[in-house]
Amino acid sequence: ITRQSLDPQRRAAPQQKRSSPTEGLCPPGHHISEDSRECISCKYGQDYSTHWNDFLFCLRCTKCDSGEVEVNSCTTTRNTVCQCEEGTFREEDSPEICRKCRTGCPRGMVKVKDCTPWSDIECVHKESGTKHTGEVPAVEKTVTTSPGTPASPCS
């Protein structure tokens, strides 16, 4: 899966209700000023915001870990997208690390799917065609995180 992390240390948005629902928000790529009067741009390549908001700060851009490659760089409206390096994958159960893909299938099995950044190789029994469910399950469903949902800690 791709990793898009939010910084849990960010200061929460102001909680007070504003007089009008149509005012007091800033567009994606911005945050609100301390006095709630103006909108301030996020810093390109440093932080971002994806939605209309009244955050006092933009969210810090994720830095890809070693073992990951940057698929999309951070903009003021979109976080960095990190992906596991070739030969490694991230599984649903442990999205915080990239695990090495298996190099081959057990005896009596044949590979039907190559390693991808989001799934290990997939092996099936030669005769029956049933999937191998060894210690590393095949992950077929791509899981992405919606903005605003912490996926893994920021590095």
Epitope: P21, T22, E23, L25, P27, P28, G29, H30, S33, E38, C39, I40, S41, K43, Y44, W52, T75, T76, T77
Partner: antibody, heavy 119, light 107 residues
Framework: KVQLQQSGAELVKPGASVKLSCKAS????????LHWVKQKSGQGLEWIGW????????KYNEKFKDKATLTADKSSSTVYMELSRLTSEDSAVYFC????????????WGQGTTLTVSS | DIVMTQSHKFMSTSVGDRVSITCKAS??????VAWYQQKPGQSPKLLIY???TRHTGVPDRFTGSGSGTDYTLTIKSVQAEDLTLYYC?????????FGGGTKLEIK
């Protein structure tokens, strides 16, 4: 093709009000923020405010808060700016412009509406 | 409000010359600067944003640079159609503000 079509020139008397329009076409109306910018004859540009049809968000430059009122009609993809208590200082060309929901620069502009305030 | 100062109201140049138009912000605007070209009787046209990113369809003779408070629009080989008015704009903090404009004239 993205187009912002503005209403025609206006000649109005001091103290009156006027409503300028800007009709958007060629893109999804609710996905972009629309702005109004003032340009007095032979002078620079001044940002008046924005209207975002996606959530009806409005923001004014404090300088124009008591002068301009921004509204929109989603059914006709049109934004409006009403200017009240007009004086000769309001005589200018008024542009509408749009920007994506990101950095505040303007990628498309209307042709401008000339407003003349004179008795 | 942030004041954007274009110190030269007019600049003289010749076709084929390299020319640089400058803009100074009253505070750090973190490269959130756009440049527009405006021809007589027309609306402004976006050239550059984020100080150095060229807008779609803008000829590569136009380049933007700068950081902090100082920004520059450079036209590396001026064409006859470039002899017009240029504005800088900060898109860092509302109210977004423009410079007073610089008019490129023939020498």
């Amino acid at each position: 093709k993205v187009q912002l079509q503005q209403s025609g020139a206006e000649l109005v008397k001091p103290g009156a009000s006027v409503k300028l329009s800007c009709k958007a076409s060629g893109y999804t109306f609710t996905e972009y923020i629309l702005h109004w910018v003032k340009q007095k004859s032979g002078q620079g540009l001044e940002w008046i405010g924005w209207f975002y049809p996606g959530n009806n968000n409005i923001k004014y430059n404090e300088k124009f808060k008591d002068k301009a009122t921004l509204t929109a009609d989603k059914s006709s993809s049109t934004v409006y700016m009403e200017l009240s208590r007009l004086t000769s200082e309001d005589s200018a060309v008024y542009f509408c412009a749009r920007h994506e929901q990101g950095p505040g620069y303007f990628d498309y502009w209307g042709q401008g509406t000339t407003l003349t305030v004179s008795s | 409000d942030i004041v954007m100062t274009q110190s030269h109201k007019f600049m003289s140049t010749s076709v084929g010359d390299r020319v640089s138009i400058t803009c100074k912000a009253s505070q750090d605007v973190n490269t959130a600067v756009a440049w527009y070209q405006q021809k007589p009787g027309q609306s402004p046209k976006l050239l550059i944003y984020w100080a150095s990113t060229r807008h779609t369809g803008v000829p590569d003779r136009f380049t933007g640079s700068g950081s902090g408070t100082d920004y520059t629009l450079t036209i590396k080989s001026v064409q006859a159609e470039d002899l017009t008015l240029y504005y800088c704009q900060q898109h860092y903090i509302t109210p977004w503000t423009f410079g007073g404009g610089t008019k490129l004239e023939i020498k």
